[in-house]
């Protein structure tokens, strides 16, 4: 059988400072059982960007609906963008375990900001 | 329609061994996490076992005891039960996870049963 | 491991009146709370998914609320049908998935 892939699409997205920036994320199976997390940048240092286990993240929502049934689709979407979210994002999935593991990552989507509009 | 066929229940002496399976169809079993629940006679459910893909997970209770397994090829699940005790003793089910968006697991459909008597 | 409990251990109630039983569990668990139905001989079933989604084919009658901690199903206008044990089930944190002991809702 097929392994899981994580499937980040974009590339990269350009958005205008105060704009929303959609970062698209799916996966081609429901297991290994265990949860996705959202990271700017890589390594050790990486920021979490969404989790939706612990963590207070305002200015991120979940594209697909909370009520979803057999949810393969990750996407987030950040509110507010400023020129500090600029970076790679990258989406994670974790294998269920104490503590859960790295499983497999997305290629990343490299997110830039435009000045807003004037 | 969903369906999930348990077999290989009996009756096993205190530190004996038996192998449960669990036929699936009407879903695409390969791609779905399964699991063991049991449940004593006249008691509550308890959960047992859980496998994904090659992940497995295990009640404290059963751990290093059961075994829990799944053949893709055949749409089988299998719980190997060794070192049987008393309180093994109980209908075992077994179950489909389903997920809802972000969160973990919940069990959308149930096989009828099998019931491990471990007595002397 | 996050317990559940589950009030009251047995409810009397007469068909076609309402039931309302809860189930309390140690630490929030958000939203991920399950309901199950259980006849007597038979396996679980699926009710209630997400504390408050009814699943495909379960009559309107039955109803789950809460979040956090406190979780209650409700049965509207109990049928025959509706006399069996209901347990909840989280699965916010695991391993080990857990139950609530059950409540068996009997003819009053």
């Known amino acids: 059988e097929e392994e899981l892939q994580v499937i980040q699409p974009d590339k990269s997205v350009s958005v205008a400072a105060g704009e929303s920036a959609i970062l698209h994320c799916t996966v081609t199976s429901l297991i290994p059982v265990g949860p996705i997390q959202w990271f700017r940048g890589a390594g050790p240092a990486r920021e979490l960007i969404y989790n939706q286990k612990e963590g207070h993240f305002p200015r991120v929502t979940t594209v697909s609906e909370s009520t979803k049934r057999e949810n393969m689709d990750f996407s987030i979407s950040i509110s507010n963008i400023t020129p500090a979210d600029a970076g790679t994002y990258y989406c994670v999935k974790f294998r269920k375990g104490s503590p859960d593991t790295e499983f497999k990552s997305g290629a990343g989507t490299e997110l830039s900001v435009r000045a807003k509009p004037s | 329609d969903v369906q999930l066929l348990e077999s290989g229940g009996g009756v096993v002496q205190p530190g004996g061994s038996l192998r449960l399976s669990c036929a699936a169809s009407g879903f695409s079993f390969s791609n779905f996490a399964v699991t063991w629940v049991r449940q004593a006679p006249g008691e509550g459910l308890e959960w047992v076992s859980t496998i994904g893909s090659g992940d497995t997970y295990y009640a404290d209770s059963v751990k290093g005891r059961f075994t829990i397994s799944r053949d893709n090829s055949k749409n089988t699940l299998y719980l190997q039960m060794n070192s049987l005790r008393a309180e093994d003793t109980a209908v075992y089910y077994c179950?489909?996870?389903?997920?809802?968006?972000?969160?973990?697991?919940?069990?959308?459909?149930w096989g009828l049963g099998t019931l491990v008597t471990v007595s002397s | 491991e996050i317990v559940l409990t589950q009030s009251p251990a047995t409810l009397s109630v007469s068909p076609g009146e309402r039931a309302t039983f809860s189930c309390r569990a140690s630490?929030?668990?958000?939203?991920?709370l399950a309901w199950y139905q259980q006849r007597p001989g038979q396996a679980p079933r699926l009710l209630i998914y997400?504390?408050?989604i009814r699943e495909t084919g379960i009559p309107e009658r039955f109803s789950g609320s809460g979040s956090g901690t406190e979780f209650t199903l409700t049965i509207t206008s109990l049928q025959s049908e509706d006399f069996a044990v209901y347990y909840c089930q989280q699965y916010y944190d695991w391993p080990p998935f857990t139950f609530g002991g059950g409540t068996k809702v009997e003819i009053k």
């Open positions: 179950a489909k996870d389903s997920t809802v968006s972000w969160s973990g697991d919940f069990f959308d459909y």
């Open positions: 997400a504390a408050r």
């Open positions: 630490q929030n668990v958000k939203n991920d």
